[in-house]
Interface confidence: medium
């Protein structure tokens, strides 16, 4: 029961986290600039991974996609890549984890298969969360190091001077959404990995066997039968009785006065 709850909660937390990563990636407010010194109007400028916007004091808002990839900082491209990788891994992880959920029955899927799928999705969620956290952190670092107070050094170009507008860059809402979402995805992934341990069938050193007492010649055999879970071997080499023992699959269907369990 605890395993099912842990797995289910991990799935839900990861789902919320991935939804948050998608939301952060699409948001326009990754960095915001208050153009306090603009003499024309109070202009509020904000930028996302895909476009930048300007909002005037009148309420007028305009957004435009970035014109070219060449004019964009390499770090922005890296952040885009990290966020997309995070989303893709998270989406695949969600798909895998749906089939891995203990509360969902799909055919005759064994617990060992569900355990493996849970672990796979958990790892995917962890990597997805790390990608999102890394992407947001890289962007935040880019703001702090490069743009905190943008330089207003003029340089002469064709047709006149060009300068970077004097603005104070601050963290946008998308950064905080990204950090929280990445953290949730990471936590969800860890929960899935924990749930995987509980889902893995415990190794049993016996199969249900029926013993056929053929006289008093009961042999004391080493090794014996062991559940073939694929999770290790009988290292303790426990001895079990096997007096003409047969597995329950081999036992005859008709009753016998000598058959007992």
């Amino acid at each position: 029961m605890a395993v099912t709850a842990c797995q289910g909660l991990g799935f839900v937390v990861s789902l919320i986290g991935i939804a948050g990563i998608i939301a952060a990636t699409c948001m326009d407010q990754w960095s915001t600039q208050d153009l306090y010194n603009n003499p024309v109007t109070a202009v509020f400028n904000y930028q996302g991974l895909w476009r930048s916007c300007v909002r005037e004091s009148s309420g007028f808002t305009e957004c435009r996609g970035y014109f070219t990839l060449l004019g964009l900082p390499a770090m922005l491209q890296a952040v885009r890549a990290l966020m997309i990788v995070g989303i893709v891994l998270g989406a695949i992880g969600l798909l895998v984890s749906i089939f891995a959920l203990k509360c969902i029955r799909i055919g005759s899927m064994e617990d060992s298969a569900k355990a493996n799928m849970t672990l796979t999705s958990g790892i995917m969620f962890i990597v997805s969360g790390l990608c999102a956290i890394a992407g947001v952190s890289v962007f935040a670092n880019m703001l702090v190091t490069n743009f905190w107070m943008s330089t207003a050094n003029m340089y002469t170009g064709m047709g006149g001077m060009v300068q970077t507008v004097q603005t104070r860059y601050t963290f946008g809402a998308a950064l905080f959404v990204g950090w929280v979402a990445g953290g949730l995805t990471l936590i969800g992934g860890v929960m899935m990995c924990i749930a995987c341990r509980g889902l893995a069938p415990e190794e049993t050193n016996y199969k249900a066997v029926s013993y056929h007492a053929s006289g008093h010649s009961v042999a004391y055999k080493p090794g014996g039968f062991k559940a073939s879970t694929g999770f290790g071997s009988n290292t303790k080499n426990k001895k079990i009785y096997d007096g003409g023992a047969r597995t329950e699959d081999e036992v005859q269907s008709y009753p016998s006065k000598h058959d007992y369990v």
Partner: nanobody, 120 residues
């Protein structure tokens, strides 16, 4: 390549009028913020008038009621109609385009300037 070319400057008598033009290429004249600035000899560059994509218009207190800013989107040109000119309006007038949308780095583009001299 962005180019802002000012024209229409010259010598004018006090009380006279002039119309400055700023022909833009490589940039939309309905940019986020289009403005006129001026720089008198030995002084700092100062804001004269500006308008935004959203239609907000602002003027420096010293030119209010005398100067009018406008734009012609079809010609991609910004204008500054200057009436009742005074001697203190003598300066080099610069056209400015500030772009915030469609670029990761907000940019400010400047023309080379046109000289306006008000003298009798």
């Amino acid at each position: 390549q962005v180019q802002l070319v000012e024209s229409g400057g010259g010598l004018v008598q006090p009380g006279g009028s002039l119309r400055l033009s700023c022909a833009a290429s490589g940039v939309d004249i309905s940019s986020d913020v289009m403005a006129w600035y001026r720089q008198a000899p030995g002084k700092q560059r100062e804001f004269v008038s500006g308008l935004t994509r959203g239609g907000s218009i602002n003027y420096a207190d010293s030119v209010k009621g005398r100067f009018t800013i406008s734009r012609d989107n079809s010609k991609n040109t910004l204008y500054l109609q200057m009436n009742s000119l005074r001697a203190e309006d003598t300066a080099v007038y610069y056209c400015n385009a500030e772009i915030y949308t469609g670029t990761f780095y907000p940019r400010s583009y400047w023309g080379q300037g046109t000289l306006v001299t008000v003298s009798s």
